[in-house]
C-alpha cells in the first residue's frame, strides 16, 4: 500500500493584515483513519491552530467540508489576519487511537503578514522655547511589517537633516515600530511654520503617511517695547504710549508704573494677527503734568507668557512744560529693555 502523503503545496503565503489567509493541505490517502490537525510551529512548543473535532477556533474555518465522506482536502482559512499570525503552519495527520498518534506532517507553509504603519504621531516640546533656540520633535509609527521603512522630516517643505531614527525591535519580529527625533532651530518667523514627519512603506499605495506639528505650539517670540510721548493736550495732559510689538503667543499683561507705583494693569485679548502670526499691542497712559512738581518716571512693564517682566522707562520732564495750552513737550526717553 502506498505511504500516506500530507501535501502542503505552498512553501510560503503572504497576506495583508486584515485579509484572510488560505493554507492548503491535501492527503494522498483516506487510510489510515484518523484526524488532521493544524499547528503553528514545530516541536513540543507548537500551538494548535485547528482541530475539527474539538475546540473553539473562531477565526479558522475549513475550506472543504471535512465531515464529508472521502474528503481529502483539509485546507483552512484564517480570517482577519494580524502580524501576530505570522509563522510556519503545519498540517499534521494522526492515526486514530487512544490517544491519537501523530503519523505524518506536511512540509509547512510559512505565513508572512504585511501590515501598514499607523498614522505618524508628532509631538513637540513640553514647554515653549524662544527664537534662536533648538527644540526637539518626536514622530512615532507602529505595527508595520516588513521592517523596511523610510521616515523624513520637513520644515515648511524643506527636508531636515538633524534627525535620529530608530526602528524596533532590531531582530526578527511580527511587527515593528519607528521613532524619530528631529531638532529644529526656531526663528522669529516660525509662528506659522509646520514640521511634517513623512513615513513611506511598501504597503502604502505610493503615498507616504504624514504627521504634522505646528511650531506655534512650541515657540515663544518675546516682544519689542517702545515708549513714546505724544504732544501735550490742551488740558495739560501728556499722552504716553507703550508699543509692544512682534510677540507670540498673545498671553501678555502690561502694567504702567508712575514713579514706581502701579497706575494701571491691562491684559491683551482679541488682538489682530500680523502676517507672520505675531501680535502687536499699544497701550496709552495720560499723565496730568499740572499735578506733578517734579519729573515723572513712567515705566511700561510687560509680562509675556509667564516669563520675567520686561521694563521700558520714560521720564516726563515737568519743568519743561510751560502751563500754556498747546505748547510742545520736552521729554527724555531713559529706557532700555530692562529685565527684572
Amino acid at each position: 500500500e502506498e505511504e500516506l502523503q500530507v501535501i502542503q503545496p505552498e512553501k510560503s503565503v503572504s497576506v495583508a493584515a486584515g485579509d484572510s489567509a488560505t493554507l492548503n493541505c491535501t492527503v494522498s490517502s483516506l487510510i489510515p483513519v484518523g484526524p488532521i490537525q493544524w499547528f503553528r510551529g514545530a516541536g513540543p512548543g507548537r500551538e494548535l491552530i485547528y482541530n475539527l473535532k474539538e475546540g473553539h477556533f473562531p477565526r479558522v474555518t475549513a475550506v472543504s467540508d471535512p465531515t464529508k465522506r472521502n474528503n481529502m482536502d483539509f485546507s483552512i482559512r484564517i480570517s482577519n489576519i494580524t502580524p501576530a499570525d505570522a509563522g510556519t503552519y503545519y498540517c499534521v495527520k494522526f492515526r486514530k487511537g487512544s490517544p491519537d498518534v501523530e503519523l505524518k506532517s506536511g512540509a509547512g507553509t510559512e505565513l508572512s503578514v504585511r501590515a501598514k504603519p499607523s498614522a505618524p504621531v508628532v509631538s513637540g516640546p513640553a514647554v515653549r522655547a524662544t527664537a534662536e533656540h533648538t527644540v526637539s520633535f518626536t514622530c512615532e509609527s507602529h505595527g508595520f511589517s516588513p521592517r523596511d521603512i523610510t521616515l523624513k522630516w520637513f520644515k515648511n517643505g524643506n527636508e531636515l537633516s538633524d534627525v535620529q531614527t530608530n526602528v524596533d525591535p532590531a531582530g526578527k519580529s511580527v511587527s515593528y515600530s519607528i521613532r524619530s527625533t528631529a531638532r529644529v532651530l526656531l526663528t522669529r518667523r516660525d509662528v506659522h511654520s509646520q514640521v511634517i514627519c513623512e513615513v513611506a512603506h511598501v504597503t502604502l499605495q505610493g503615498d507616504p503617511l504624514r504627521g504634522t506639528a505646528n511650531l506655534s505650539e512650541a515657540i515663544r517670540v518675546p516682544p519689542f517695547l517702545e515708549v513714546t510721548q505724544q504732544s501735550m493736550r490742551a488740558d495739560n495732559q501728556v499722552n504716553v504710549t507703550c508699543q509692544v510689538t512682534k510677540f507670540y503667543p498673545q498671553r501678555l499683561q502690561l502694567t504702567w508704573l508712575e514713579n514706581g507705583n502701579v497706575s494701571r494693569t491691562e491684559m491683551a485679548s482679541a488682538l489682530p494677527e500680523n502676517k507672520d502670526g505675531t501680535y502687536n499691542w499699544t497701550s496709552w497712559l495720560l499723565v496730568n503734568v499740572s499735578a506733578h512738581r517734579d519729573d515723572v518716571k513712567l515705566t511700561c512693564q510687560v509680562e509675556h507668557d509667564g516669563q520675567p517682566a520686561v521694563n521700558k522707562s520714560f521720564s516726563v520732564k515737568v519743568s519743561a512744560h510751560p502751563k500754556e495750552q498747546g505748547s510742545n513737550t520736552a521729554a527724555e526717553n531713559t529706557g532700555t529693555n530692562e529685565r527684572n
Epitope: K11, S12, S14, V15, A16, S112, R114, P146, D148, I149, T150, A200, H201, V202, T203, L204, Q205, G206, D207
Partner: antibody, heavy 116, light 109 residues
Framework: VQLVESGGRLVQPGTPLTLSCTVS????????MGWFRQAPGKGLEYIGI?????SPYYASWVNGRFTISKTSTTMDLKMNSLRSEDTATYFC?????????????WGPGTLVTVSS | DIQMTQSPSSLSASVGDRVTITCRAS??????LAWYQQKPGKAPKLLIY???FLYSGVPSRFSGSGSGTDFTLTISSLQPEDFATYYC???????????FGQGTKVEIK
C-alpha cells in the same frame, strides 16, 4: 480586472503623443499604477508610477520628457518631443494588493513608432 | 540607481530539465524582488513576488529564493509552455524606484 492601453501610432520625431490606460474592475484611487516600455527585441524599462492619490514619480532618465496623470478610470502618459529611441511597446500595469514592490496585472501594450 | 544583473542572458534546455536563473542587485534590496515571464508579443506575467512567494495561479514548479543582493528563479521541471523570456525586477524601498534585469531567454534545446 483589466487594463487596456491605447494611443500608440506612427509619429514623426519631435511630435508629442499621449497614451491612455483604461482600467476596469477596480478603482484607480486604490492602487499605484505604472508605465513601462520595451523597445523591439530589448528588455523591459520602467518609466514611472502614479500613486493612489495622484502623485507621479519617474525614473531618473525621464528628465521631464514624460508626464503621468490620471482621471477616475484612465491613466495617461504624455510624451513630449518624441525621438526615434522612444520606439517601443508601452505597457501599463497595476501593483499588487500587498504592496508596491511588484506588478500583478498588465495591459497587452500599445506600439509607438517614431520615424520620419 | 540600482543595477540588476541577470544571468545567463540565454539558455537552451529540454522538457523536464531543472532550470536556474540568477539575478544580482548592485546593492541590497532585501526581499523586494519579483520574477516575470514574457512570451513574444505578450505582456509580462508575474510569477514570484517578494523573492519567494508564488503568485496565485502560477504552477508550483516555479520557485524563488534569495534576499539582499542574490536571487534565484528555479523551474523544477521545464514544460513546453515555459519556453519564454524571464525578467527579474527590484524595488528599492529608499529611492522607491524599480529596475529590471536584462532578461533570460529560455529556448528549446
Amino acid at each position: 480586472v483589466q487594463l487596456v492601453e491605447s494611443g500608440g501610432r506612427l509619429v514623426q520625431p519631435g511630435t508629442p503623443l499621449t497614451l491612455s490606460c483604461t482600467v476596469s474592475g477596480f478603482s484607480l484611487s486604490s492602487y499605484v499604477m505604472g508605465w513601462f516600455r520595451q523597445a523591439p527585441g530589448k528588455g523591459l524599462e520602467y518609466i514611472g508610477i502614479i500613486s493612489s492619490s495622484g502623485s507621479p514619480y519617474y525614473a531618473s532618465w525621464v528628465n521631464g520628457r514624460f508626464t503621468i496623470s490620471k482621471t477616475s478610470t484612465t491613466m495617461d502618459l504624455k510624451m513630449n518631443s518624441l525621438r526615434s529611441e522612444d520606439t517601443a511597446t508601452y505597457f501599463c500595469a497595476r501593483v499588487g494588493p500587498l504592496g508596491v514592490d511588484y506588478f500583478n496585472i498588465w495591459g497587452p501594450g500599445t506600439l509607438v513608432t517614431v520615424s520620419s | 540607481d540600482i543595477q540588476m544583473t541577470q544571468s545567463p542572458s540565454s539558455l537552451s534546455a529540454s522538457v523536464g530539465d531543472r532550470v536556474t536563473i540568477t539575478c544580482r542587485a548592485s546593492q541590497s534590496i532585501n526581499s523586494y524582488l519579483a520574477w516575470y515571464q514574457q512570451k513574444p508579443g505578450k505582456a509580462p506575467k508575474l510569477l514570484i513576488y517578494s523573492a519567494s512567494f508564488l503568485y496565485s495561479g502560477v504552477p508550483s514548479r516555479f520557485s524563488g529564493s534569495g534576499s539582499g543582493t542574490d536571487f534565484t528563479l528555479t523551474i523544477s521541471s521545464l514544460q513546453p509552455e515555459d519556453f519564454a523570456t524571464y525578467y527579474c525586477q527590484s524595488w528599492h524601498y529608499i529611492s522607491r524606484s524599480y529596475t529590471f534585469g536584462q532578461g533570460t531567454k529560455v529556448e528549446i534545446k
